[in-house]
């Protein structure tokens, strides 16, 4: 970890980090690292790991250092921790490190695992989870279902998975998801394998999830980052055609913002 | 590519006050602070002061207090210094500096004040 | 405020020479140091900053080291055009302070 000189936690408290837009984001996007102390300081340093000097630093005359980082680029992400000095603590003094923050800059969030539970084969009455399993927090989940164009199920998660709820005499089927940020500007996980779900007496089968005809590709998420569960038009698949908007059966349910969570 | 124009040069008399510009291109002016710098004929250089143009703090060597004050025009990337009460003592040239996180300094070109009745 | 003491003042050396020029600290500037170059009538130049990072488009020949109080500057092999002040900055402390500045001419 960083070992930059520091005072006891009480004397120099540490500041807080922050990432603008996200700490998640795609080449190319402009972000800014927010560093706030608790005292005005005179200059703030973000520091990589293991180093005893900052990286990057600025002076400032205020509580507040923000740092541009213009068109990001995959090397600028990692992980960093802001500091801060004040004149009067004495030569390379700092304060007690800030919590670490992880800058994902990236085309692409790796692809979600898709399995069900406790299992793929459903009994009579039973329900089945299916749990969609990414490797990032606080990402939006999204499940759909074979020859349903619009997204089946929608969950935003603090955990690095989602649970989706099958009803049992609606579960069978064959089943893909994938996450994306929550918010602007998004970043999409590549889909997962597809999972089919199959009643007892019927041996599940799995393949990947270019091969399930008739379930659409992820496109971006909703335009409004205060949508929960986007409607079908917000999901344009990049390289394929949109399916037209299926009637409204419990087998094409097309959830609109506000999100509901209708079992299948 | 990086450019911080400076105003030409200015001739004034005792006791008035002069106005430098420093219009900044290249890259985003309100991302980087902007630092003044004094050098008298034929001697080393002093730090007058920087402002951040985001939010318009300053901060002063003691030594320039009264003496300098920084403003900015984000609409037009451009930072300015004004002195004030001049005397022979402030003909000197000045140079704008933006720092970038680095540590790195970028100069302008200078503006050469005389002071002189 | 932090004392730069810069030495030599001022010293003639010949093309091709390895020169150095260095930078003492009244305490300690923990590397934030550049080294600056200024012709006649121009603006300064920044050579190295952090000590020893070279500027993007400076010649290979400049080099910068030292930690803690003491920096130093080199010239590997003195080309004609290096002739000029060179001047080291602090700006680990506020207000940020320079050396006295070295007097390089060509022998």
């Known amino acids: 970890d960083i070992t930059p000189s520091v005072p006891p936690a009480s004397y120099h408290p540490k500041p807080w980090l922050g990432a603008q837009p996200a700490t998640v984001v795609t080449p190319g996007v402009n972000v800014t690292l927010r560093c706030r102390a608790p005292q005005p300081a005179w200059r703030f340093g973000l520091f990589k790991p293991g180093e005893i000097a900052p990286l990057l630093f600025r002076d400032v005359s205020s509580e507040l250092a923000e740092f541009f980082l213009e068109e990001v680029t995959p090397a600028q992400g990692g992980i960093y921790r802001c500091c801060y000095r004040r004149p009067d603590w004495g030569p390379g003094v700092w304060s007690q490190p800030s919590d670490v923050l992880e800058l994902l800059v990236t085309e692409e969030l790796p692809r979600p695992s898709l399995v069900a539970l406790p299992g793929p084969v459903v009994g009579p009455g039973a329900n089945v989870s299916l749990r969609c399993a990414g490797r990032l927090r606080n990402m939006s989940f999204v499940l759909y279902r074979e020859g349903v164009a619009a997204p089946l199920q929608y969950r935003h998660s603090a955990q690095p998975w989602a649970d989706f709820t099958l009803l049992g005499a609606r579960a069978p089927g064959t089943y893909s998801c994938y996450y994306h940020t929550p918010s602007a500007p998004y970043v999409l996980s590549q889909r997962s394998e597809v999972l089919v779900i199959s009643w007892e007496g019927e041996g599940p089968e799995a393949r990947p999830a270019s091969s399930a005809p008739g379930m659409q590709a992820p496109g971006p998420p909703p335009s409004d980052p205060g949508a929960q569960a986007p409607s079908l038009s917000s999901f344009r698949p990049r390289g394929l055609v949109l399916q037209p908007l299926l009637p409204q059966t419990q087998d094409s349910w097309d959830p609109a913002p506000p999100p509901s969570d209708p079992g299948v | 590519e990086i450019q911080l124009q400076q105003s030409g040069p200015e001739l004034v008399k005792p006791g008035a006050s002069v106005k430098v510009s420093c219009k900044a291109s290249g890259y985003v002016f309100t991302s980087y602070n902007m630092y003044w710098v004094k050098q008298s004929h034929g001697k080393s250089l002093e730090w007058i002061g920087y402002?951040?143009?985001?939010?318009?703090?300053?901060r002063y060597n003691q030594k320039f207090k009264g003496k300098a004050t920084l403003t900015v025009d984000k609409s037009s990337s451009t930072a300015y210094m004004h002195l004030n009460s001049l005397t022979s003592e402030d003909s000197a040239v000045y140079y704008c500096?933006?720092?970038?996180?680095?540590?790195?300094?970028?100069w302008g070109q200078g503006t050469t004040l005389t002071v002189s009745s | 405020d932090i004392k730069m003491t810069q030495s030599p003042s001022s010293m003639y050396a010949s093309l091709g020479e390895r020169v150095t020029i260095t930078c003492k600290a009244s305490q300690d500037i923990n590397s934030f140091l550049s080294w600056l170059q200024q012709k006649p009538g121009k603006s300064p130049k920044t050579l190295i900053y952090r000590a020893n990072r070279l500027v993007d488009g400076v010649p290979s020949r400049f080099s910068g080291s030292g930690s803690g109080q003491d920096y130093s500057l080199t010239i590997s092999s003195l080309e004609y055009e290096d002739m000029g002040i060179y001047y080291c900055l602090q700006y680990d402390d506020f207000p940020y302070t320079f050396g006295g500045g070295t007097k390089l001419e060509i022998k």
């Open positions: 500096a933006r720092l970038d996180y680095y540590g790195n300094f970028y």
């Open positions: 402002i951040d143009p985001y939010n318009g703090g300053t």
